[in-house]
């Protein structure tokens, strides 16, 4: 069967990293630069992915096969296969429309990347704080006053005052 | 503290290969986002990008030096290596490593000169 | 290659008084909001210093009378009110697109 498709289309014998140049009797033509063929018996090179901007090259294009992005340090990969690319933020930040901005009072956020999200409400489980929450860190909670035993006490430090206005990074 | 010092043979022939070292401290590549480049500056002219390499050791070169050009990395030990084959006068300057983060050279060394002469 | 052109070429400022210095790049240096070019300070003798990131964005411990502002192909550096200190040799940078490249300079000096 290789042998009768081969007769039939001389394309067919072209290898990945070449095309079958209809300009010059179906010849196999080494892919121009900045273009790949990852399969054989095609009729046109693909042109290569650029990495530019936010938009690092993690793999140079090669005759047969594509360039490979990832995001330049100080950002991070969306989507599939890295097709965006969002900035960084640091711990106890969270990205917005003008930059990244502090946690507001009450929220944290231990990544460089994702929402601020509330601090756990220890009551709600009928436990005490431990230790106090900040804008990079959850709280920590600690057993419910009832779980102590006679005669200890749970301290419970107080919240730390409010913070000061948000400013950008 | 970020500091870089670079370190090469001051003189060369021309087409010998000239070999630069980057001894840096107060950062490690092989933390995430870290990187080394090579900058060179001919007396009393500017600044030209030669190559990177990054903490997960992908390296990048000038396309019009490339052929010339091989960046390498000992982590360890903390230091950064450039080669660049077949000088000529023409490569006489000053030879910066810098700190990368985010794509800017954050930090530079002190700059190690190098002449290429008969 | 992104050529960079920077003016002027050299300018004599009054102490005290603003300088402003422009980068202009043959095409956008402009990411997903981002714009990736960057300024540095050289003086006589000494390596480069990194002053703004990403055209507007002042780095750690550098005064702020040094500000960027500009996108897609026109930057801007300007110092507020100009100090002895300053004398030294301005870069802009484009790290948008390999090669990475550098404008030819603008000298500083005090009038």
């Known amino acids: 069967f290789e042998r009768t498709r081969s007769l039939q289309d001389p394309c067919s014998n072209c290898p990945a990293g070449t095309f079958c140049d209809n300009n010059r009797n179906q010849i196999c033509s080494p892919c121009p630069p900045n273009s790949f063929s990852s399969a054989g018996g095609q009729r046109t090179c693909d042109i290569c992915r650029q990495c530019k901007g936010v938009f690092r090259t993690r793999k140079e294009c090669s005759s047969t096969s594509n360039a490979e992005c990832d995001c330049t340090p100080g950002f991070h990969c969306l989507g599939a296969g890295c097709s965006m690319c969002e900035q960084d933020c640091k711990q106890g930040q969270e990205l917005t429309k003008k930059g990244c901005k502090d946690c507001c009072f009450g929220t944290f956020n231990d990544q460089k990347r994702g929402i601020c999200r509330p601090w756990t409400n220890c009551s709600l489980d009928g436990k005490s704080v431990l230790v106090n929450g900040t804008k990079e860190r959850d709280v920590v909670c600690g057993p419910s006053p009832a779980d102590l035993s006679p005669g200890a006490s749970s301290v419970t430090p107080p919240a730390p005052a409010r913070e000061p206005g948000h400013s950008p990074q | 503290q970020v500091t870089l010092k670079e370190s090469g043979p001051g003189i060369l022939q021309p087409s010998q290969t000239l070999s630069l070292t980057c001894s840096f401290s107060?950062?490690?590549?092989?933390?995430?986002?870290?990187?080394v480049g090579w900058i060179r500056q001919p007396s009393g002219k500017g600044l030209e990008w030669l190559a990177h390499i990054w903490w997960d050791d992908v390296k990048r070169y000038n396309p019009a030096l490339k052929s010339r050009l091989t960046i390498s990395k000992d982590t360890s030990s903390s230091q950064v290596f450039l080669k660049i084959a077949s000088v000529d006068t023409a490569d006489t300057a000053t030879y910066y490593c810098?700190?990368?983060?985010?794509?800017?050279?954050?930090?530079w060394g002190q700059g190690t000169l190098v002449t290429v002469s008969a | 290659d992104i050529v960079l052109t920077q003016s002027p070429d050299s300018l004599a400022v009054s102490l005290g008084q603003r300088a402003t210095i422009s980068c202009r790049a043959s095409?956008?240096?402009?990411?997903?909001?981002?714009?990736?070019m960057h300024w540095y300070q050289q003086k006589p003798g000494q390596p480069p210093k990194l002053l703004i990131y990403r055209a507007s964005n002042l780095e750690s411990g550098i005064p702020a009378r040094f500000s960027g502002s500009g996108s897609r192909t026109d930057f801007t550096l300007t110092i507020n009110v100009v100090e002895a200190d300053d004398v030294a040799t301005y870069y802009c940078?484009?790290?948008?697109?390999?090669?990475?490249?550098f404008g030819g300079g603008t000298k500083l000096e005090i009038k």
């Open positions: 095409e956008s240096v402009d990411s997903y909001g981002h714009s990736f």
């Open positions: 107060g950062f490690s590549l092989s933390t995430s986002g870290m990187g």
């Open positions: 810098a700190q990368m983060t985010s794509s800017v050279f954050a930090y």
């Open positions: 940078h484009q790290s948008y697109e390999e090669p990475w490249t």
